[in-house]
């Protein structure tokens, strides 16, 4: 069964900067990626980005940089303009499409112990699993 | 302007083959994924095959698998349905779609259909 | 495969009324259904997709809402041209599954 895995790590540099790395385990071909805080997109979460593997990638506020790391996972950068780091309490979720297969969607958050500048092992939340 | 017309429909034995053709106009058909959907008589719809951008990745219904194969090509804006080992239960008004990535892969265009009748 | 239960069959109303579709999948699909009409002699063309967004030119008195596995299609106020069947569909999962579909007749 596919997979996906989300990742969410601080930038040492600057604490108000933040970074989500998601990736889709499994065969297939990924057609669309979309990126979402507070929640699935949908069900109560922002869209904060839509990436395609050939039409390009459209991002929102406050996403910095959206791009494909590599066929199947990508980074998001996010700019937070707060002094209070709202990103640090938040769920980030990806959910990838893959035709003619379908979506996988996992959704995670920074963890609460980590150091900045310390890379957080990935700790997918799987949501939704359709074989559940 | 977008168009696709499915051609190829008839009255055939039990048993027998069709070979189905829709022919795509009006957009870049190789950026595109598409399928192939039945509307039974019961006016029920099917989705019978499917077959990604590049043609690598195929889904038949379970019904239809190992009697049917999706193919397309691309030099051609061409999907094609072959159909073998025809059954009664193949009786229906067969549509191509095409699947746009970013509504979800909702179809937003579909041909006008062609009818394929299985008769024993 | 995800089964998409859609009801009622049939709806018989009048011009000017609000009318609501629902449709309850088996399993979780998230976002990931679409709203389809078929006008009579016609092939299915899109109105909605990802629950309420709505396609090129589909008038804003259709509406799509839920997530999950429970979603509601309605016409706010029905006109005479909505005379059609209407039919959802999932895509989160293949294969890509219709619901049964709803036949709105016009008094």
């Known amino acids: 069964t596919p997979e996906v895995w989300v990742q969410v790590q601080m930038e040492a540099t600057e604490l108000s900067s933040f970074t989500v790395h998601c990736g889709f385990l499994g065969p297939g071909s990924i057609s669309l990626v979309t990126v979402s805080w507070g929640g699935p997109d949908g069900a109560g979460g922002t869209k904060l980005a839509v990436l395609h593997p050939e039409l390009g990638t459209r991002q929102w506020a406050p996403a910095r940089q959206a791009r494909w790391e590599t066929q199947s996972s990508i980074s998001l950068a996010l700019e937070d303009s707060g002094a209070s780091s709202p990103f640090a309490n938040t769920t980030f979720c990806c959910k990838f499409a893959s035709f003619p297969e379908g979506s996988w969607e996992s959704c995670g958050s920074l963890p609460p112990s980590s150091d900045p500048g310390l890379s957080a092992p990935p700790t997918p939340v799987p949501i939704l699993r359709a074989d559940l | 302007d977008v168009k696709l017309v499915e051609s190829g429909g008839g009255l055939v034995k039990l048993g027998g083959s069709l070979k189905l053709s829709c022919a795509a106009s009006?957009?870049?058909?190789?950026?595109?994924?598409m399928s192939w959907i039945r509307q039974t008589p019961e006016k029920r719809l099917e989705l019978v095959a499917a077959?990604?951008?590049?043609?690598?990745?195929?889904y038949y219904l379970d019904t239809v698998k190992g009697r049917f194969t999706i193919s397309r090509d691309n030099a051609k804006n061409t999907l094609y349905l072959q159909m073998s080992s025809l059954k009664s239960e193949d009786t229906a008004l067969y549509y191509c779609?095409?699947?746009?990535?970013?509504?979800?892969?909702?179809?937003?265009?579909w041909g006008q259909g062609t009818s394929v009748t299985v008769s024993s | 495969s995800i089964v998409m239960t859609q009801t009622p069959k049939f709806l018989l109303v009048s011009a000017g009324d609000r009318v609501t579709i629902t449709c309850k999948a088996s399993?979780?699909?998230?976002?990931?259904v679409a709203w389809y009409q078929q006008k009579p002699g016609q092939s299915p063309k899109l109105l909605m997709y990802?629950?309420?967004n709505h396609y090129t030119g589909v008038p804003d008195r259709f509406i799509g809402s839920g997530y999950g596995t429970d979603f509601t299609f309605t016409i706010s106020t029905v006109q005479a041209e909505d005379l059609a069947v209407y039919f959802c569909?999932?895509?989160?999962?293949?294969?890509?599954?219709f619901g049964g579909g709803t036949k709105l007749e016009i008094k």
């Open positions: 399993q979780s699909v998230t976002n990931d």
């Open positions: 009006g957009f870049t058909f190789s950026s595109y994924h």
């Open positions: 077959i990604n951008s590049n043609g690598i990745n195929t």
């Open positions: 569909q999932q895509a989160y999962r293949s294969p890509w599954t």
């Open positions: 779609a095409r699947h746009e990535d970013y509504y979800g892969f909702a179809m937003d265009y």
């Open positions: 990802y629950v309420s």
